[in-house]
């Protein structure tokens, strides 16, 4: 997992957005379940424009997107790889 060197936060996301991020601009998604000092699920998205953002895990568009990506990954290489990892 990528970690920031200058922060002691157990949770990586200090704030989240709920606005829609289009699948076409997503490069990578990481879903981190609660654990290791962070009591909440965190969803981090890396975009093709070299941005990294935290997304509200409860956002309906995100749930749809994750289902879409995971269903595609069953049949082909996913456009946006999803990784589910525990915090390091």
């Amino acid at each position: 997992i990528l970690e920031a060197h200058y922060t002691n936060l157990k949770c990586r996301c200090s704030g989240v957005i709920s606005t829609v991020v289009g699948l076409n601009i997503i490069d990578r998604i990481q879903v981190t379940p609660p654990g290791n000092g962070c009591p909440k699920t965190e969803v981090v998205i890396w975009t093709k424009m070299k941005k990294v953002i935290c997304v509200n895990p409860r956002a309906k568009w995100l749930q749809r997107l994750l289902r879409h990506v995971q269903s595609k990954s069953l049949s082909s290489t996913p456009q946006a790889p999803v990784s589910k990892r525990r915090a390091a």
């Epitope: 990528l2 920031a4 996301c13 200090s14 965190e42 990294v52």
Partner: antibody
Framework: QVTLKESGPEILQPSQTLSLTCTFS??????????VGWIRQPSGKGLEWLAN???????YYNPSLINRLTISKDTSNNQAFLKITNVDTTDSATYYC??????????????WGQGVMVTVSS | DIQMTQSPSSMSASLGDRVTITCQAS??????LVWFQQKPGRSPRPLIY???NLANGVPSRFSGRRSESDYSLTISSLESEDMADYHC?????????FGAGTKLELK
């Protein structure tokens, strides 16, 4: 420990090309999310972002200078480069090499070199 | 491009004073803002990220807040080592843009 060091000419003449090198250690430009950029600061003035290059060779430039800037990298030698063509006296500044890493929380320009002072003078 | 209007451009204050520096964004940057401190003859270093979060090793007298498009950096009780230039940076979108900087001097 992360370090970056800039090198280049101290003085050059108007219309020449400025070539800067950033040599870094403590990280590599290979892994996902790693980037190096250039920022300049004229003496006594504010900071101006110039360009970024990322691990995947994606490049971003300041639109006000895009026709004069070229950023590149040599991943195996831990170096990044910036060329500025057709310089004039307004390009006189301290040039900083900076690192960015796409981690969350994301802090662009988390490490800076010491800077190299460049003077354009006829 | 997003313009960052930083004020004041310079200020003098006494030790122990409460000092506030402001950057106003020309459009919504959704907290994508970093404050940098630059001591004389040195390179800048990050102080505050995402508008309100203290970088590691930064004293708690520094704080950041947001009020709509205005982002502020406050030093609650000024110390001599705080004499420096302060710069805000928006990274909401390219091109990344800095404020013009604030020079903080001792009164």
């Amino acid at each position: 420990q992360v370090t970056l060091k800039e090198s280049g000419p101290e003085i050059l003449q108007p219309s020449q090309t400025l070539s800067l090198t950033c040599t870094f250690s403590g990280f590599s430009l290979s892994p996902y999310g790693m980037g190096v950029g250039w920022i300049r600061q004229p003496s006594g003035k504010g900071l101006e972002w110039l360009a970024n290059i990322w691990w995947d060779d994606d490049k971003y430039y300041n639109p006000s200078l895009i026709n004069r800037l070229t950023i590149s990298k040599d991943t195996s030698n831990n170096q990044a480069f910036l060329k500025i063509t057709n310089v004039d006296t307004t390009d006189s500044a301290t040039y900083y090499c900076v690192r960015s890493e796409l981690v969350m929380p994301y802090v662009p320009f988390d490490y800076w070199g010491q800077g190299v002072m460049v003077t354009v003078s006829s | 491009d997003i313009q960052m209007t930083q004020s004041p451009s310079s200020m003098s204050a006494s030790l122990g004073d409460r000092v506030t520096i402001t950057c106003q964004a020309s459009q919504d940057i959704e907290n994508d803002l970093v404050w940098f401190q630059q001591k004389p003859g040195r390179s800048p270093r990050p102080l505050i990220y995402y508008a309100t979060n203290l970088a590691n090793g930064v004293p708690s007298r520094f704080s950041g807040r947001r009020s709509e498009s205005d982002y502020s950096l406050t030093i609650s009780s000024l110390e001599s080592e705080d004499m420096a230039d302060y710069h805000c940076l928006q990274f909401k979108q390219y091109p990344y843009t800095f404020g013009a900087g604030t020079k903080l001097e001792l009164k």
